[in-house]
């Protein structure tokens, strides 16, 4: 089982220094600051799931040098910043979504010896991201359906 920690209070002070190794901001309808870094030098697991996030501001994650797991499940991401994708040792947990194509491509081109990238569908089942992108995000499909969620075709 993956480790877990209790959800923080909804009133998050982004100027505060967080000392914990795990931070849970799940389901708080947060808006991440674009010009400010989260101050959490010990955090190895950051849960941002279910916040309605459309993007992950790269500055917000800039100082999280120890971060290993970033959970952004249940967020309608439209893009993943290249600088974040290039962090080869970061385990990104995200919904199967065509917006992950850039993340997949950057990892493929910059990170050697990686375990297969995974994504999660609406039933919380894991899928190989490469396979999902190939089936659900082919050029014709992607332009027709945008970067929303897609069901995995079997």
């Amino acid at each position: 089982l993956e480790p877990s920690c209790t959800v923080s209070s909804a009133d998050v002070d982004w100027n505060a220094e967080f000392s914990a190794t795990c931070l849970n901001f799940s389901g708080l309808s947060l808006s991440l600051p674009h010009n400010q870094s989260l101050r959490a030098s010990n955090v190895i697991l950051l849960d941002l799931s279910g916040n309605g996030l459309r993007e992950l501001p790269v500055t917000f994650f800039a100082h999280l040098q120890k971060l290993e797991v970033l959970n952004v499940l249940r967020n309608p991401l439209s893009r993943v910043d290249g600088a974040l994708a290039a962090r080869c040792d970061l385990d990104l947990q995200a919904d199967c979504n065509c917006a992950l194509e850039s993340w997949h491509d950057i990892r493929r081109d910059n990170c050697s010896g990686q375990k297969p990238l995974l994504c999660w569908d609406t039933t919380s089942s894991q899928h190989n991201l490469s396979a999902f992108l190939e089936v659900s995000c082919a050029p014709g499909l992607a332009s027709a359906t945008g970067s929303g969620h897609h069901h995995h075709h079997h």
């Epitope: 089982l1 480790p3 920690c5 914990a20 190794t21 697991l45 040098q65």
Partner: antibody, heavy 125, light 107 residues
Amino acid sequence: QVTLKESGPGTVQPSQTLSLTCSFSGFSLSTSGMGVSWIRQSSGKGLEWLAHIYWDDDKRYNPSLKSRLTISKDTSSNQVFLRITSVDTADTATYYCARRPRDFYGGGHWYFDVWGAGTTVTVSS
Amino acid sequence: DVVMTQTPKSMSMSVGERVTLNCKASENVGTYVSWYQQKPEQSPKLLIYGASNRYTGVPDRFTGSGSATDFTLTISSMQAEDLADYHCGQSYNFPLTFGAGTKLELK
């Protein structure tokens, strides 16, 4: 096979500096997420975490001892060091080094998976 | 600092009995708790991490449970080789802290 082995002076005089070495094999301290901690145990007592050094040379210390502790590493020779200044009899203990691994198949955990056998240090004049 | 309180300090059990060891954190530590077994004159060995994950090679008679502040290590059927000190430790916040240990003895 991952192994760690502590070495130290055995006996050190009060007010002197204690220098400990942890020699390890089977992993690299340049691997992302990897780290080594020093933990001690006084006779018949519980475990006390002292300091941790990360793969990127970042360090964490127990605040109760921070002013007296220095942790460092030599990645190329697979060694981690701990210095404790101004020792007194309360520093008499068995000193362990232990590895915090990076688990790439279920990350986000923090635990010590392998410990050294320990080195006994007596502070006495 | 997070204080980890282990109970009981010691317990005498017979082979085959079910053993329950408790560990209470002074504040919420999620599931960032590990259990270590330490036999006489040996170093600690990892049994359980993440409160409930059995470490590789650890017999399945050892089970960890709990979250937040209350944690339990259970030995379903005690064996003679289980006589040892058992330590819980939290890694949710620095400084990392351990309980004082529970000594498991033979009745």
